[in-house]
Interface confidence: medium
């Protein structure tokens, strides 16, 4: 008798659909060549397939097999008009599953997902379940069409990461899932506004968002010109706004404000504030004479170009002597003074057409 | 379809306590967050407590109004929610309402009311 | 606390007429980050508990006769019907569920004329 073929092996690609046959050739010498039958089981509909090779081969492959269905494969040694027993095998070729499920469009109670739907005529569409993550008992469930790519999963929880499979269904059967996990958003607070400004001081108020299930607010401010130097307050989810002390003066600040819930924090609402100049400080007086005196200060922490020096007599209602000098000085000596007279001196240090606050100071001729 | 059914209302002498209940059927209770929504007579609605699903740690939420008197509690096994309430007031005469949140815990609309139960507090 | 104002408090009105009623909120409750506005609206018949009709303020809930429409955004809204059934004759409230506390309206009654 004819010795069969050993070690068949088979393999279905799910992405292409096509099943490729293989076998260890037959030990009898001078054989015409092999015969390869498919057919599905137990009298299943679904095409019987079959193929004749040379002699010199050892695999073949077959299109067009039903995803999901089963087939017994049978290799036969062929010899003239006499056939050996086959070697025979079982596949059920898998159900092509998606390979390109990415994820759009996330909001607070929303996730949109999209697909390239699989060119395959047995595929009658795609079935999509949600699961929270840690959860077992899918909370969603829902059937598309074959055509269909996108979908949006909607009522879903804020900040909570969900299980989201993709499974391609064919007439009795089904692919194995995709499955991918998200996150839904927590929504942002909104209005950002700065109030109240002062050269150390600034008030930040928000909108929260329409939400009384937020953990906090997270508050982080820093220097624009040095990001890494970062304050956090985490402030009561009932209040929405906040006074940051003990800042540079003179100083631009990034300020992001984030809700947060159950840990989870949502995208920042920014903004930009520059915090005002300080007054220079310590006035002081020397060199008193009848018509002239000079006036020494402390120059303020913020960054300035200049100070500007107004003087008049104390009860005197017209306008007051002005001078300016440059940054890198913190004196003046006012001169063509009345002799036995009690003087007001203003300081304030300029950065550009931006003014300080008045340093105040009195002396007498 | 949806059902709540409350039970247990009745009447109560002031600074007495009362037990209500809520019977779900038709919907996946341990998924949703419960409310009970309250109107006195002749009156418009309040609402009056909240509890999240077992995912939200079963996080409660109370009206002001009934802060550490009342108490709301559920048991997914048996698809019931609860309104303890203790130290009544004459002003908590009310029919209470069972109430499913609809959309998710950001979206406190209620998309399914039971019938009520009616709480009279009086001596 | 967000307040709920609702005027007229009671419409007395004929069948087939057009019916309209207000709601205004004293804080907005328009999120711009998604351009919603957290309202409802709830149907509430002699001896019934509340049904609801609206969401978001303008969203019909599933089931709902296409006569009753909500709409306005910010702090005014309106619940109209477009054509009353006899079977619309009760009370309607509205509610906002933009922030803790919950609050409804007073209510506006619709009576028959």
């Known amino acids: 008798p004819l010795s069969p073929p050993t070690n068949l092996h088979l393999e279905a690609n799910p992405d292409t659909g096509v099943l490729t046959v293989s076998w260890e050739r037959s030990t009898t010498p001078d054989i015409t060549g092999y015969r390869i039958t498919t057919t599905p089981t137990n009298g299943q509909q679904g095409n019987s397939l079959e193929e004749v090779v040379h002699a010199d081969q050892s695999s073949c492959t077959f299109d067009n097999l039903s995803p999901g269905l089963e087939y017994n494969v049978s290799v036969y040694t062929v010899k003239d008009d006499k056939e050996s027993v086959p070697i025979s095998d079982t596949i059920i070729p898998e159900v092509p599953q998606l390979t390109d499920l990415s994820f759009v469009d996330i909001t607070d109670s929303s996730i949109g997902l999209r697909w390239t739907p699989l060119n395959s005529s047995t595929i009658i569409g795609y079935r999509i379940t949600v699961v929270a993550a840690g959860e077992g008992i899918p909370i969603f469930e829902d059937f598309v069409d074959s055509s269909v790519g996108y979908y949006t999963v909607t009522g879903l929880e804020p900040g909570i990461d969900y299980d989201i499979s993709v499974i391609t269904l064919i007439n009795g059967g089904e692919s194995a899932p995709t499955t991918l996990t998200q996150q839904t958003a927590v929504p942002p607070p909104t209005d950002l506004r700065f109030t109240n400004i002062g050269p150390d001081t600034m008030r930040v108020t928000w909108a929260p968002p329409p939400s009384i299930d937020l953990t906090n607010f997270l508050v982080r401010y820093s220097p624009v010109k040095n990001e890494e130097d970062v304050a956090e307050l985490s402030i009561s989810p009932s209040d929405n706004a906040v006074v940051l002390t003990n800042l540079l003066p003179g100083t631009e600040y990034v300020v992001s404000v984030s809700s947060v819930y159950e840990q989870h924090e949502s995208t920042p609402l920014r903004g930009r504030q520059k915090t005002g100049l300080d007054s220079p400080t310590g006035i002081d007086f020397s060199d008193i004479t009848a018509n002239s005196f000079t006036v020494h200060w402390i120059a303020p922490r913020a960054t300035i170009t200049g100070y500007r020096i107004r003087h008049h007599p104390e009860h005197f209602s017209g306008r007051p002597r002005e001078d300016r000098v440059p940054h890198s000085r913190n004196s003046i000596t006012l001169t063509n003074l009345t002799p036995g007279t009690e003087y007001v001196v203003s300081i304030v240090a300029l950065n550009g057409r931006e003014e300080s606050p008045l340093l105040i100071g009195q002396q007498s001729t | 379809e949806v059902q709540l059914v409350e039970s247990g209302g009745g009447l109560v002498q002031p600074k007495g306590s009362l037990k209500i209940s809520c019977a779900a059927s038709g919907l996946t209770f341990n998924t949703y967050a419960m409310n009970w929504v309250r109107q006195a007579p002749r009156k418009g609605l309040e609402w009056v407590a909240r509890?999240?699903?077992?995912?939200?740690?079963?996080?409660?939420y109370y009206a002001d109004s009934v802060k550490d008197r009342f108490t709301i509690s559920r048991d997914d096994s048996q698809s019931m929610l609860y309104l303890q309430m203790n130290n009544l007031k004459t002003e908590d005469t009310a029919m209470y309402y069972c109430?499913?949140?609809?959309?998710?815990?950001?979206?406190?609309?209620?998309?399914?009311w039971g019938a009520g139960t009616t709480v009279t507090v009086s001596s | 606390d967000i307040v709920m104002s609702q005027s007229p408090s009671s419409l007395a009105v004929s069948v087939g007429e057009k019916v309209t009623m207000s709601c205004k909120s004293s804080q907005s409750l328009l999120y711009s980050s998604n351009q919603k506005n957290y309202l409802a609206w709830y149907q509430q018949r002699p001896g019934q508990s509340p049904k609801l009709l609206i969401y978001?303020?303008?969203t019909g809930e599933s089931g709902v006769p296409d006569r009753f429409t909500g709409s306005g955004s910010g702090t005014d809204f309106t619940l109209t019907i477009s054509s009353v059934k006899a079977e619309d004759l009760a009370v309607y409230y509205c509610?906002?569920?933009?922030?803790?506390?919950?609050?409804f309206g007073a209510g506006t009654k619709l009576e028959l004329k």
């Open positions: 509890i999240r699903s077992k995912s939200n740690n079963y996080a409660t």
């Open positions: 509610q906002q569920y933009y922030s803790y506390p919950l609050t």
């Open positions: 109430v499913k949140q609809g959309g998710n815990s950001l979206y406190w609309y209620f998309d399914v």
């Open positions: 978001w303020a303008s």
